[in-house]
């Protein structure tokens, strides 16, 4: 004969567990009906009733199958700084990241809690590792033989125009003069620029600024309790 | 609006049965997720929950007191009632029922009847 | 059965300090624990439950957290009305008070 299938609430048998999306609830001692994403748990079972859910309100959410008596809160809105990459639904968190030239200074588990702008190098500084969605632009002097003349947080040393007849030698903030009307190039001319850190969830870590490079806001924020797990929420 | 009265003896014998009636209004006990419930509270000492009877039927007792309890309903008369026996006087105390919501916390409570138990 | 430590079972603060009780479960309660305020010959009222969520009416200088077994109650800053006695209840498993915590004004 096929074993007979449980219906919730069930007493389990000694030693076993729950099945998927049920819950063992030990004041009723009993499995019990875990909520879907998106609800939560209304009344909790009994040992002759099982869990009756609810849809969560407006502005807070379930993610997981759970039994907890409350949605979680959805965070706050996204900042002017930040962009709003998953709206708030019943099932799930809104999330924010960082607009363009701006990077993650305090991560939270899904998006950013804060960000920003990216560093900028000023002139005779260019651009040793760009910044990304996580850690700031680092600046770096540029070497004998390459310039820099911007403020930029994209732009790299280049090196100076090789002269037939040099004019004005070039430093680390200005390229050479030449006299000659057909100066010779190592590199392609103008300004090279490094792609701006495109937007993907990643962990952050804390940038080590450098002492050459132009100022930049530090950030220190105590972090806010981070929203309640859902309890027991796991399939 | 919630509110929930209890009603018993003042005094009863040790070894006597006590009987306590908890009326309430505001709402059902045919209503999913509503239970009432009993908590006691000994002379300048802590709470002590000792029992408490869901919308279903189903029935939850203090274990060390399990032996004692009784509880039961009558919906219609929006009443729950609790009998202890084999009173003895450590079992002086302030008496209270309190309606327990779904999600199993006591919100509202009555103001509680004293019973004192001596010869 | 779950056993509920709550310290301290009393205090002394003047009116505007911050009050602290905390109670410890002896197992893990899944943040199913409420908080009640006592004053003499009344019955307890409801200030907070599932660890953090205030009732409705009750002012914001209450609040809680915790989870696990370790569960905080704060008075932000003590106001005379405040002058009670202060219960745990945890409901994750049956349900048990906690010893209670007298908290009186300096």
């Known amino acids: 004969l096929p074993a007979q299938v449980a219906f919730t609430p069930y007493a389990p048998e000694p030693g076993s567990t729950c099945r998927l999306r049920e819950y063992y609830d030990q004041t009723a001692q009993m499995c019990c009906s875990k909520c879907s994403p998106g609800q939560h748990a209304k009344v909790f079972c009994t040992k002759t009733s099982d869990t009756v859910c609810d849809s969560c309100e407006d502005s807070t959410y379930t993610q997981l199958w759970n039994w907890v008596p409350e949605c979680l809160s959805c965070g706050s809105r996204c900042s002017s700084d930040q962009v709003e990459t998953q709206a708030c639904t019943r099932e799930q968190n809104r999330i924010c990241t960082c607009r363009p030239g701006w990077y993650c200074a305090l991560s939270k588990q899904e998006g950013c809690r804060l960000c920003a702008p990216l560093r900028k190098c000023r002139p005779g500084f260019g651009v040793a590792r760009p910044g990304t969605e996580t850690s700031d632009v680092v600046c770096k002097p540029c070497a004998p033989g390459t310039f820099s003349n911007t403020t930029s947080s994209t732009d790299i040393c280049r090196p100076h125009q090789i002269c037939n007849v040099v004019a004005i030698p070039g430093n680390a903030s200005m390229d050479a003069v030449c006299t000659s009307t057909s100066p010779t190039r190592s590199m392609a001319p103008g300004a090279v620029h490094l792609p701006q850190p495109v937007s993907t969830r990643s962990q952050h870590t804390q940038p080590t600024p450098e002492p050459s490079t132009a100022p930049s806001t530090s950030f220190l924020l105590p972090m806010g309790p981070s929203p309640p797990a859902e309890g027991s929420t796991g399939d | 609006q919630v509110t929930l009265k209890e009603s018993g003896p003042a005094l009863v014998k040790p070894t006597q049965t006590l009987t306590l009636t908890c009326t309430f209004s505001?709402?059902?006990?045919?209503?999913?997720?509503?239970?009432v419930g009993w908590i006691r509270q000994p002379p300048g000492k802590a709470l002590e929950w000792l029992a408490h009877?869901?919308?279903?039927?189903?029935?939850f007792y203090n274990p060390s007191l399990k032996s004692q309890l009784t509880i039961s309903k009558d919906t219609s008369k929006n009443q729950v009632v609790l009998t202890m026996t084999n009173m003895d006087p450590v079992d002086t105390a302030t008496y209270y029922c309190?309606?327990?919501?779904?999600?199993?916390?006591?919100?509202?409570w009555g103001q509680g009847t004293t019973v004192t138990v001596s010869s | 059965d779950v056993q509920m430590t709550q310290s301290p079972s009393s205090l002394s603060a003047s009116v505007g300090d911050r009050v602290t009780i905390t109670c410890k479960a002896s197992q893990d309660i899944n943040k199913f624990i409420a908080w009640y305020q006592q004053k003499p010959g009344k019955a307890p009222k409801l200030l907070i439950h599932y660890t953090s969520t205030l009732q409705p009416g009750i002012p914001s200088r209450f609040s809680g957290s915790g989870s696990g077994r370790d569960y905080t109650f704060t008075i932000s800053s003590l106001q005379p009305e405040d002058i009670a006695t202060y219960y745990c209840?945890?409901?994750?498993?049956?349900?048990?008070f906690g010893g209670g915590t007298k908290v009186e004004i300096k």
């Open positions: 209840l945890q409901y994750g498993n049956l349900w048990t």
């Open positions: 009877i869901w919308w279903d039927d189903d029935k």
């Open positions: 309190a309606r327990i919501t779904g999600t199993r916390y006591f919100d509202y």
């Open positions: 505001g709402f059902s006990l045919s209503t999913s997720g509503m239970g």
